[in-house]
């Protein structure tokens, strides 16, 4: 049976040319991190972090993605384009695929609220 | 290329203790977890636990909690599974398997216990 | 605890035959994985998430399956495919099928 929890940075908002921190993080179970993968919205790959190969950014991405803090993805330079879901994918052994989900709405407005709280979604 | 080398057959008595060892090559051992399955002659395979090989942490199936120990030698890429106080039932060969979808286990270790 | 049935237990197959081996489970898994074993040989992954070919695998062995049915089917059955197969799934407690031994006539 699978243990763990996925908790998130689950709703957040960042001001548009900002940053902002993907956060996702995995709890209450003994398995072994093999890999994780980010992912956006319409189901491209923005990131991996692989245990043994280390962190991967896609080309289309590498501009404007940094790796971290810890497993986490910063999404730097945000625009408009950049507002909708995010998905972080744990494959361990022996649980298999733990998912967690993010909403990112990137707010043209100065006084975008930065929410950093962590949720289970 | 990625290997896992188990050491040779083992010929014990009951009571006995033996350690059988699984020495990976070819990718970053603490990258995986290790799992040990037994097999009995004639019968499937049965799943026996695994170990952290990050943190070190074995966690055991119920049906080898007791007697089973799984341990590591990091520096030399090596995992262990010791079985202490033998009994016939014992007799089977052992596999180390890499904890992921890549396929990849030892060659086997066969262990005997006999009076 | 998963456990995991296969079906039949014993098949016998001719030369060129299509052939599908099954593995229910009692409750519902997210993957399986196939493995081949021959006598005195370690397991050899065939098919590993259900229906992903394992490198040097023969086109020939495909998998598919949801839920709590899962199947491993052989194309053409040669003479080298004559071997046990077994299904394994993780899911916290990984299990083994009781396993499928494959007859060539």
């Known amino acids: 049976m699978m243990t763990g929890t996925i908790e998130t940075t689950g709703n957040i908002s960042a001001k548009k040319g900002g940053s902002v921190i993907l956060q996702c993080h995995l709890s209450s179970t003994m398995a072994q991190v093999t890999q994780v993968n980010w992912e956006q919205h319409d189901h491209s790959l923005l990131a991996i972090r692989n245990a043994e190969l280390g962190w991967h950014i896609y080309p289309a991405f590498k501009d404007r993605v940094a790796p971290g803090p810890g497993l986490g993805l910063t999404l730097q330079s945000l625009t408009m384009n950049d507002t909708g879901e995010y998905f972080c994918t744990y494959h361990t052994y022996p649980d298999g695929t733990y998912r967690g989900r993010i909403f990112l709405e990137v707010l043209e407005s100065s006084v975008a609220e930065h929410s950093a709280r962590f949720q289970i979604p | 290329q990625i290997q896992l080398v188990q050491s040779g057959p083992e010929l014990k008595k009951p009571g006995e203790t033996v350690k059988i060892s699984c020495k990976a090559s070819?990718?970053?051992?603490?990258?995986?977890?290790m799992s040990w399955v037994k097999q009995t002659p004639g019968k499937g395979l049965k799943w026996m636990g695994w170990i952290n090989t990050y943190s070190g942490v074995p966690t055991y199936a119920d049906d080898f909690k007791g007697r089973f120990a799984f341990s590591l030698e990091t520096s030399a890429s090596t995992a262990y599974l010791q079985i202490n106080n033998l009994k016939n039932e014992d007799t089977a060969t052992y596999f180390c398997t890499r904890g992921d979808t890549g396929g990849y286990w030892g060659q086997g270790a066969t262990l005997t216990v006999s009076s | 605890q998963i456990v995991l049935t296969q079906s039949p237990a014993i098949m016998s197959a001719s030369l060129g035959e299509e052939i599908t081996l099954t593995c229910s489970a009692r409750?519902?898994?997210?993957?399986m994985h196939w493995y081949q074993q021959k006598s005195g040989t370690s397991p050899k992954l065939l098919i590993y998430?259900?229906?992903n070919l394992a490198s040097g695998v023969p086109s020939r062995f495909s998998g598919s399956g949801s839920g709590t049915f899962f199947s491993l089917t052989i194309s053409s059955v040669e003479a080298e495919d004559a071997a046990d197969y077994y299904c394994?799934?993780?899911?916290?407690?990984?299990?083994f099928g009781g396993g499928t031994k494959l007859e060539i006539k």
């Open positions: 998430s259900t229906s």
């Open positions: 394994h799934q993780w899911g916290g407690y990984p299990t």
């Open positions: 409750s519902s898994v997210s993957d």
């Open positions: 070819g990718y970053t051992f603490t990258a995986y977890g």
